[in-house]
């Protein structure tokens, strides 16, 4: 069963974060999510990765999707699973790794012109309706525009970063664009290898905050350059 997966992977026996809760005891505000917390644990590598229960794809990382780990699709707990690489079977876009999408049940590379056009078309359409999609997983459940009284806050629909409050940028999330937090030191960032590759991302990240730049994490040793992790680091 899924719970045996959770238990065998010792999800409840992780070493405690050095600083206690993410926001540190006594503070109601948690630290910004990211690769490192001040005084906290380092980001887990694949070797000691713990199953992460989820209800929606949006809760998982950029390289994951949410599903039952059992083939039959146990109606119980779902966890974040590693995304499917090119030519692997899929049932929806979120299952495919960044730079790919699900076409005819197979993860295929996002053809820049075709796929970007498809996304932008959908974004334009969504802004023409009373029921815009608010974020990635809202494609299944649309919310009325009354929801946007918190305009410019995290999760609000936007067209450009100037629509968002301070500390947020306007970034793509599936078929819409929403205000997301500008990245802080230690958070994972996206280093674009070629001009215009931003258009391929279904889950676009914000840029690094002031005084930070997106660079390869020094202690992140991996076989290939292409899979190295980039994080926001001080200039």
């Amino acid at each position: 069963t899924l719970n045996s997966v959770l238990n065998s992977n010792a999800i409840k026996n992780l070493p405690p974060p050095l600083g206690g809760a993410a926001g540190h005891p006594g503070s109601a505000v948690s630290a910004a999510p990211g690769i490192l917390y001040p005084g906290g644990n380092k980001y887990q590598t694949i070797d000691n990765y713990q199953p992460y229960p989820c209800a929606e794809d949006e809760e998982c990382g950029t390289d994951e999707y949410c599903a039952s780990p059992t083939r039959g699709g146990d109606a119980g707990v779902q966890i974040c699973l590693a995304c499917r690489k090119r030519r692997k079977r899929c049932m929806r876009h979120a299952m495919c790794c960044p730079g790919n999408y699900c076409k005819n049940g197979i993860c295929v590379s996002s053809d820049q012109n075709h796929f970007r056009g498809e996304i932008e078309e959908t974004i334009t359409e969504s802004f023409g309706n009373d029921h815009s999609t608010l974020d990635g997983y809202s494609r299944r459940t649309t919310l009325s525009s009354k929801m946007y009284h918190t305009k410019g806050q995290e999760g609000s629909v936007c067209l450009r970063s100037s629509d968002c409050a301070s500390g947020l940028c306007c970034a793509r999330h599936f078929w819409s664009k929403i205000c997301k937090p500008v990245l802080k030191e230690g958070q994972v960032c996206t280093k674009h290898r070629r001009k215009g590759s931003h258009g391929l991302e279904i889950f676009q990240r914000c840029y690094c905050g002031e005084g930070l730049s997106c660079r390869i994490q020094k202690d992140h040793h991996q076989a290939s350059n292409s899979s190295r992790l980039h994080t926001c680091q001080r200039h």
Partner: nanobody, 124 residues
Amino acid sequence: KVQLVESGGGLVQPGGSLRLSCAASGFPFSIYPLKWVRQAPGKGLEWVSHISRDGGRTMYADSVKGRFTISRDNAKNMLYLQMNSLKPEDTAVYFCARSAGKVVSRASLENDYRGQGTQVTVSS
């Protein structure tokens, strides 16, 4: 800023009940699934329960299934955990949490947004 404030913890005898509450602010509450996690003394974070954004789907760890009930009130930006038939092994600091989502490559409980926690002690 994402803010999560838990309350309702306390000292209770085995077999007793408690209702934890979590007041959320700083983000559009109704579009996020939410969860409760706990941390027993000297242990790591343990996932307890999960609720979908509309409250229609809930999930529980085996250790609390049938005893705990998670719920939410989107109009009030509140998350709840009703804990019945409490056992000494339920003693922990309980946190309400929200996923960090797509800003990390791989999700982990440590990367979640969470509050300061509320202490639950089950002892006779």
